[in-house]
């Protein structure tokens, strides 16, 4: 009788436990982007390295066609850094004329796509005006936060201008997520 | 017989489990650097406070000689913020002459050193051009991501110019890691 | 006898384990701020959305009156992003006159309040000079790190100028924490 009482008690308390090492995780790193057609009025999505160098996916977290696929429901920490680089922005010209203007900008968005829902959800956005005068410029935008995701959700990173992304080094531009 | 079946089943499922509270963790905070010689052609490494104020190391994660020592293999979230500050950058002068130039820049690198591997691995880099005119400037670079580390790996934070780092407050410049 | 030996052994090893899904967690998103009186010489605290859209609190992590309440002691990862926006900063005028000046700046502080301790503790600070010329500007400050917190601690996000915070979108300005 004692044994019978113990077993369900054990299951009740410990059933939700799981080894940390088997949680879905991914760290993706930048690769050279190929110019492609994008949906009008939508920022283009970056594609990523998922197995070479520092990049990995594990425990059923898969990467396919610019998306990280969420294999199980739960709370995930999601992060990305995109390093941008460019030449003197337009505002320098307009500044000289003494007129303020809408500045150039760089934007990163981490987006969630749920197949059963028509519109993507913007989870995180980092956006920055760029008004540099007289020199080349470069700078990162970093994002990271926790979200409740559902099995089957897909995550991607969109940027305002794919031609300004620094794709030269895996430590400069990256994207990751892990189940908490 | 039933008891004999239960025990191995229990071990099989729960052996990898571990209390979250005993995972290696560290949060290090800035201390004033002493000007010292560094390796040529390598960004200097910062040293850190590891026990006073907000800083701590626990569960076999140790800090020694600018390095965080990884005590067990696994996936770690690693982060750092470095706040930089300086005076008017040179590009202001060159701008006036109307010629673009290579801007001043600030860079943070989180580096992994593996004794069995000759070259350090750059895990994370944040790099930013600084072209400020007419005033002192200050700004942070934040980095954070997940990496698979091995027992014995060492982590450090390197910066492009230690003389521009803000050493004044523990909440402005910091470095941490924790096993997921 | 064997059963008696097993039970305490089991308790000893597994007592600290707990399901990840029942850990205190919160992700709060920006809402329109109402101008309010603030303590002199203290940056104003932001208030937050805690249940609509992407925002949530769970597992006894509660939000009340600008504070996240920590329901149990442990190591927490705490993060926030605040997106600021403004018009040409004053320094552009002063620059034209050729005189250097103290730049405008934007600052975010994540602060811990412990009722038994008279002074709040600044956990994280992101501070940036803003010296833009000739255009509107916008930019985020991101912060995140791990801290050992005690049950009953309260967390808030303070900013240098509440009127410059971009409260238009939940993905631009946010605040979160989760027990590791």
């Amino acid at each position: 009788l004692k044994g019978q009482e113990f077993a369900p008690s054990h299951q009740q308390v410990y059933a939700p436990l799981r080894a940390d090492g088997d949680k879905p995780r991914a760290h993706l790193t930048v690769v050279r982007q190929t110019p492609t057609q994008h949906f009008k009025n939508q920022f283009p999505a970056l594609h990523w390295e998922h197995e070479l160098g520092l990049a990995f996916t594990k425990n059923r977290m898969n990467y396919t066609n610019k998306f990280l696929l969420i294999p199980e429901s739960g709370d995930y920490f999601i992060y990305s850094q995109v390093t941008f680089r460019g030449m003197t922005s337009e505002c320098s010209e307009i500044r000289r004329a003494g007129r303020p203007n809408k500045p150039d900008s760089i934007t990163v968005v981490i987006t969630k796509v749920t197949d059963s829902y028509p519109e993507p959800t913007q989870l995180l956005m980092g956006t920055k005006s760029v008004c540099e005068v007289g020199s080349n410029w470069f700078q990162p935008i970093y994002l990271g936060a926790m979200f409740s995701l559902q099995e089957g959700d897909k995550l991607m990173v969109n940027v305002s201008d794919i031609s300004l992304v620094d794709y030269t080094k895996e430590d400069k531009t990256f994207f990751g997520a892990f189940l908490l | 017989l039933k008891g004999q079946e239960f025990a191995p089943s229990h071990q099989q499922v729960y052996a990898p489990l571990r209390a979250d509270g005993d995972k290696p963790r560290a949060h290090l905070t800035v201390v004033r650097q002493t000007p010292t010689q560094h390796f040529k052609n390598q960004f200097p490494a910062l040293h850190w406070e590891h026990e006073l104020g907000l800083a701590f190391t626990k569960n076999r994660m140790n800090y020694t000689n600018k390095f965080l020592l990884i005590p067990e293999s696994g996936d770690y979230f690693i982060y750092s913020q470095v706040t930089f500050r300086g005076m008017t950058s040179e590009c202001s002068e060159i701008r006036r002459a109307g010629r673009p130039n290579k801007p001043d820049s600030i860079t943070v690198v989180i580096t992994k050193v593996t004794d069995s591997y000759p070259e350090p691995t750059q895990l994370l880099m944040g790099t930013k051009s600084v072209c400020e005119v007419g005033s002192n400037w200050f700004q942070p670079i934040y980095l954070g991501a997940m990496f698979s580390l091995q027992e014995g790996d060492k982590l450090m934070v390197n910066v492009s110019d230690i003389s521009l780092v803000d050493y004044t407050k523990e909440d402005k410049t910091f470095f941490g890691a924790f096993l997921l | 006898l064997k059963g008696q030996e097993f039970a305490p052994s089991h308790q000893q090893v597994y007592a600290p384990l707990r399901a990840d899904g029942d850990k205190p967690r919160a992700h709060l998103t920006v809402v329109r701020q109402t101008p309010t009186q603030h303590f002199k010489n203290q940056f104003p605290a932001l208030h937050w959305e805690h249940e609509l859209g992407l925002a949530f609190t769970k597992n006894r992590m509660n939000y009340t009156n600008k504070f996240l309440l920590i329901p149990e002691s442990g190591d927490y990862f705490i993060y926030s992003q605040v997106t600021f926006r403004g018009m040409t900063s004053e320094c552009s005028e002063i620059r034209r006159a050729g005189r250097p000046n103290k730049p405008d700046s934007i600052t975010v502080v994540i602060t811990k309040v412990t009722d038994s301790y008279p002074e709040p503790t600044q956990l994280l600070m992101g501070t940036k000079s803003v010296c833009e010329v000739g255009s509107n500007w916008f930019q985020p400050i991101y912060l995140g790190a791990m801290f050992s917190l005690q049950e009953g601690d309260k967390l808030m996000v303070n900013v240098s100028d509440i009127s410059l915070v971009d409260y238009t979108k939940e993905d631009k300005t946010f605040f979160g924490a989760f027990l590791l």
Partner: antibody, heavy 117, light 108 residues
């Protein structure tokens, strides 16, 4: 505008203790290190040591055994004490703000300290 | 500690002329961490240059710094009446921080 105002005894006898204070106004006190530097008459400058708002100090090894720098953040002040002075310690003593690091962008007016029996 | 030797001891020049001041270190200065200050009689020093070549805030562009390793130079392109003063170099690549003995720039 940042200002550093310093004061203290100007005439000391050998073996006495030099004591100077520097008050900072017009800027943040906690965002900088604060330094003492001296200059013997007609000579170059010598770095004595520094302190942060939290009381962390660094000293010139050649003076470390005799020097104490302290801070009063509530008053935005920092002080220098130097024990067992000799004629060789006669100098103009300056307080200064360290910015960005290890260089000095704002200085006090200087205090001439003369050690003579 | 690193010793800094400035030369010449005194430089006699006329307004409008250029001035070149030298600072030599007893060993290599890490990362060109060298600063220059101007000091007028009865005044505190004023920071001109840091990082060997970075002008401090508000310093006119007739002041420029150069050099690396052990040899550094401060150049004043066109001397103005207010530039006649003593100039000190300071290294901060190694602890303790040290200063040179100064170069006096006087009116000829």
């Amino acid at each position: 505008q940042v200002q550093l105002q310093q004061w203290g005894a100007g005439l000391l006898k050998p073996s006495e203790t030099l004591s100077l204070t520097c008050a900072v106004s017009g800027g943040s006190f906690s965002d900088y290190f604060w330094t003492w530097i001296r200059q013997p008459p007609g000579k170059g400058l010598e770095w004595i040591g520094e302190i942060s708002h939290s009381g962390r100090t660094n000293y010139n090894p050649s003076l470390k055994s005799r020097v104490t720098i302290s801070v009063d953040t509530s008053m935005s002040q920092f002080s220098l004490k130097m024990t067992s002075v000799t004629a060789a310690d006669s100098a103009v003593y300056y307080c200064a703000r360290d910015y960005p690091n290890w260089v000095f962008d704002y200085w006090g007016q200087g205090t001439l300290v003369t050690v003579s029996s | 500690e690193i010793e800094l030797t400035q030369s010449p001891g005194t430089l006699s020049l006329s307004p409008g002329e250029g001035a070149t001041l030298s600072c030599r270190a007893s060993q290599s200065v890490f990362n060109s961490y060298l600063a220059w200050y101007q000091q007028k009689p009865g005044q505190a020093p004023r920071l001109l240059i840091y990082g060997a070549s970075r002008r401090a805030t508000g310093i006119p562009d007739r002041f420029s710094g150069s050099g690396s390793g052990t040899d550094f130079t401060l150049t004043i392109s066109r001397l103005e009446p207010g530039d006649f003063a003593v100039y000190f170099c300071q290294q901060y690549g190694n602890s303790p921080l040290t200063f040179g003995g100064g170069t006096k720039v006087e009116i000829k």
